[in-house]
């Protein structure tokens, strides 16, 4: 805590300007009026204050706003944002997307810090949902943002926001997250025609059920192997050889290179070898001719 000392004669700050960088910490404390600082926060960023000096400025704002800073101040914090703790940020009420962008810009190029995570959490909770503009902004700064959310948090994403999602934003999502996002994407894109729909829905298909894959197989979509390999194994297993052939189109030849990996490996084990042979790819491991297939899971459900 900086000692309370009187401001030396002639040193009282009339405005926030570069002359303040020559002030000692105690002089900043004594000579800079907190209300002046609050109204001229936009100037702080342009002045090369030391970290110690920034600590003093933060202290002055904390004294002026013990319940949390107003948004007019928050929007212009600039590098002073890096001095804030998650506890400080929890006191804020950030409603403007411009404020959010300004603070994310300060942290740009770095990993998501606890401060940024808290800021985003406060902002999204304040809005009540992850709307399209917010999602656009967050994924622009942090492409992995969407996949860092829990399925519960993702449930607040309205289908209209899905338009803001780019394929790379889903790269690190696991099946539980895609289970939540896929139905929203399905709803969001349902007015598009077949080929356009597939282009948009493709990245979300790791959350699709079997029947949707069957429907897509009737659409001449030519799914690539990378997408196929990300499908839920249990959604792929019930597909017939003919359906997989239709789903993949010319990419069906890629199954050979993936025959030892899930879901291809598990799917092969469920198919009749005769049916696999019709693909002419030399896939091995199917059910031999003459064997009876019992679906025990269905048997259980029916008993």
């Amino acid at each position: 805590e900086v000692e309370k000392t009187a401001c030396p004669s002639g040193k009282k700050a009339r405005e926030i300007d570069e002359s303040l960088i020559f002030y000692k910490k105690w002089e900043l404390e004594a000579c800079v009026d907190a209300a002046l600082l609050a109204t001229q926060m936009d100037r702080v960023n342009a002045i090369p204050f030391t970290y110690e000096q920034l600590d003093v400025l933060k202290h002055k704002l904390d004294e002026l706003y013990p319940q949390g800073y107003p948004e007019s101040v928050i929007q212009h914090l600039g590098y002073l944002f890096l001095k804030m703790s998650p506890e400080d940020i929890r006191k804020w009420n950030v409603t403007s997307l411009e404020t959010l962008k300004a603070l994310l810009e300060v942290n740009k190029g770095h990993e998501m810090s606890p401060q940024v995570a808290t800021l985003i959490d406060r902002f999204v909770k304040g809005r009540g949902q992850l709307d399209k503009d917010t999602l656009d902004t967050l994924t622009a700064f942090y492409p992995g943002y969407l996949c860092s959310l829990s399925p519960e948090e993702l449930s607040s994403v309205p289908p209209s926001s899905i338009w803001a999602v780019r394929p790379q934003d889903l790269d690190t999502c696991d099946p539980r997250q895609l289970d939540v996002l896929y139905p929203k994407a399905r709803l969001a894109f349902q007015n598009m025609n077949g080929s356009e729909y597939f282009v948009k829905i493709q990245s979300f298909l790791g959350g699709a059920p079997t029947e949707d894959l069957k429907a897509l197989s009737q659409q001449n979509v030519s799914m690539d192997l990378a997408t196929f390999m990300k499908l839920r194994t249990d959604a792929v297993l019930p597909l017939t050889v003919a359906e997989v052939q239709k789903l993949l189109g010319p990419h069906v030849e890629g199954l050979k290179a993936e025959e030892r990996h899930r879901p291809v490996r598990d799917w092969i084990l469920r198919q009749r070898q005769d049916d696999l042979d019709t693909l002419g790819l030399g896939l091995q491991g199917g059910i031999p001719n003459g064997y009876l297939v019992l679906d025990l899971s269905m048997q259980e459900a029916l008993s």
């Epitope: 209209s160 539980r176 289970d179 349902q190 029947e211 459900a301």
Partner: antibody, heavy 122, light 107 residues
Framework: QVQLQESGPGLVKPSETLSLTCTVS????????WSWVRQPPGKGLEWIGY???????NANPSLKSRVIISVDTSKNQFSLKLSSVTAADTAVYYC????????????????WGRGTLVTVSS | EIVMTQSPATLSVSPGERATLSCRAS??????LAWYQQKPGQAPRLLIY???TRATGIPARFSGSGSGTEFTLTISSLQSEDFAVYYC?????????FGQGTRLEIK
Amino acid sequence: QVQLQESGPGLVKPSETLSLTCTVSGGSIQNYYWSWVRQPPGKGLEWIGYIFYSGSTNANPSLKSRVIISVDTSKNQFSLKLSSVTAADTAVYYCAREVGRIAVAGWFFDLWGRGTLVTVSS
Amino acid sequence: EIVMTQSPATLSVSPGERATLSCRASQSVNSNLAWYQQKPGQAPRLLIYGASTRATGIPARFSGSGSGTEFTLTISSLQSEDFAVYYCQQYNNWPLTFGQGTRLEIK
């Protein structure tokens, strides 16, 4: 062919929790999305929410705070719990299958259970 | 939420005649509209989806039209088994919502 059958108590006391189960027979619960829809006597239909076999759900905002939808894939069943019920929750409750193969997308219902009447009364 | 309004509440038509039922959405639902038929003591039955596509096994006398906010279900020549309550449902956005129903009765 696939059939749906609702089961559960026909009478629930006010402020208690309504619990219903839908059993899917003749097909796997894993292939589709499954919904609950209700219909108060002499009134229209109201969508309650859906579940995917992985447990992912979505509920009508008007009921969300009181609704829990869950799934038991080993039994090919999904369930509805509606808490703090009042007389306004008296209705026929239907389980329904969200349409599959006939359309690439579309949240409407091509298969319904017969429905079960639940009366909320002390 | 999107509010679906059906009219008329009750429609009286003679067998063999044409019946026209209307459904209006409070905002555009594109063509994401389904029609159902419900008879007393039974579950609803899907008739039409995509505003105009007949579901499997639905007779050709049932037809749907419209897009945006105005939709129509037409039954060209009423059979005795067609007298029931008809509901429209939008699936353009969550929550999924239904109209309050039109009761089609014998005149």
